[in-house]
């Protein structure tokens, strides 16, 4: 499978809410011997690979924000912790996978990564990520609502553990 990022850039005014989205593409095994770990984190465009560094989003780590389930099941993050920080990550039956950030501030600007790990019971895993930029703007040049820019190419990584 692969991860698609429908939009590579989100430009939003301060105070607005935004939902960053990733989509799982390709065949997804729904067997009992496989589980999916999905999460979000902030990162930087590293020299070696984008999304290698996993920084917190509003003080919540990628582990705080993770969703864990089999196949294309729907799932949500723990509501109390995330919602206290104005965050919610969710996943639906169609492979869509998102994080919603409420009441954006300039500090929320940066590179965001979604990560999906397909973990199998026989000690293998397949790890894929997608990256997107969030720009939060203020002042007269800021848009009145979020403006999204489609991705021209997918920025993803595949890791298989032997």
């Amino acid at each position: 499978f692969k991860v698609a990022t429908p939009y590579s850039l989100y430009v939003c005014p301060e105070g607005q809410n935004v939902t960053l989205t990733c989509r799982l593409l390709g065949p997804v095994d729904k067997g009992h011997d496989v589980t999916f770990y999905k999460t979000w984190y902030r990162s930087s465009r590293g020299e070696v690979q984008t999304c290698s560094e996993r920084r917190p989003i509003r003080n919540l780590t990628f582990q705080d924000l993770h969703l864990h389930h089999g196949g294309h099941q729907a799932a949500n993050t723990s509501h109390d912790l995330a919602q206290r920080h104005g965050l919610e990550s969710a996943s639906d039956h169609h492979g869509n996978f998102s994080i919603t950030m409420r009441n954006l501030t300039l500090l929320d600007s940066g590179l965001y990564c979604c990560l999906v790990v397909e973990i199998r019971h026989h000690h293998s895993e397949h790890r894929v990520h997608g990256a997107m930029e969030l720009q939060v703007q203020t002042g007269k040049d800021a848009p009145s609502n979020c403006v999204v820019y489609p991705s021209s190419s997918q920025d993803s990584e595949n890791i298989t553990a032997a």
Partner: antibody, heavy 120, light 107 residues
Framework: QVQLVQSGAEVKKPGSSVKVSCKAS????????ISWVRQAPGQGLEWMGG????????NYAQKFQGRVTITADESTSTAYMELSSLRSEDTAVYYC?????????????WGQGTLVTVSS | DIQMTQSPSSLSASVGDRVTITCRAS??????LNWYQQKPGKAPKLLIY???SLQSGVPSRFSGSGSGTDFTLTISSLQPEDFATYYC?????????FGQGTKVEIK
């Protein structure tokens, strides 16, 4: 904050078995791999094997295959490592450690260690 | 199994010194390389993951670099609390393997 708390020190006779426990708190237990790593006195770190609780199947280093059994109890968020046919060279501190994601990612949380002494 | 070879096995340095430890893998592991610090009687502590990413809460004087088979851990200005043993670990393949360790001692 994730914490891994291990059982206390053990003194065992050669040929016997030891079972060390590792209780996790402060995070999701089921979907994270737990590895066991040992360290003989004055020596380096040696990976013994690992398990992801939701699957229940463990993976072992060849050196310990047949002598080590790693299990996990999801209901109590506890992982166990049992080592049989003990010999004096098994005297070591045994650590449990949690992987950040999946089977092979970095070990980001560690237990405090359990000293197992094998002596006649 | 992938062999991890660290050098030097020990070194003496003074507070403020720049210290470099290297780790070589017997085959390519891309950037699946982690560094740990261990103090006597304590569990190891993760410093660097993915070869160059700093674990949360670790001081920025620690940095990692490399890919493939050759990796480096650098402490830009050694502090008193940095005297410890450092281990590299490959996270690309089972079995997971560690370097033999580098002991950083006070000169």
């Amino acid at each position: 904050q994730v914490q891994l708390v291990q059982s206390g020190a053990e003194v065992k006779k050669p040929g016997s078995s030891v079972k060390v426990s590792c209780k996790a708190s402060g995070g999701t237990f089921s979907s994270y791999a737990i590895s066991w790593v040992r360290q003989a006195p004055g020596q380096g770190l040696e990976w013994m094997g690992g398990i992801i609780p939701i699957f229940g199947t463990a993976n072992y280093a060849q050196k310990f295959q047949g002598r080590v059994t790693i299990t996990a109890d999801e209901s109590t968020s506890t992982a166990y490592m049992e080592l049989s046919s003990l010999r004096s060279e098994d005297t070591a501190v045994y650590y449990c450690a949690r992987h950040s994601i999946g089977w092979v990612a970095e070990l980001d949380y560690w237990g405090q260690g359990t000293l197992v002494t094998v002596s006649s | 199994d992938i062999q991890m070879t660290q050098s030097p096995s020990s070194l003496s340095a003074s507070v403020g010194d720049r210290v470099t430890i290297t780790c070589r893998a017997s085959q390519s592991i891309a950037t699946s390389l982690n560094w740990y610090q261990q103090k006597p009687g304590k569990a190891p502590k993760l410093l660097i993951y993915y070869a160059s990413s700093l674990q949360s809460g670790v001081p920025s004087r620690f940095s990692g670099s490399g890919s493939g088979t050759d990796f480096t851990l650098t402490i830009s200005s050694l502090q008193p609390e940095d005297f410890a043993t450092y281990y590299c670990q490959q996270g690309a393949y089972y079995p997971l393997t560690f370097g033999q360790g580098t002991k950083v001692e006070i000169k």
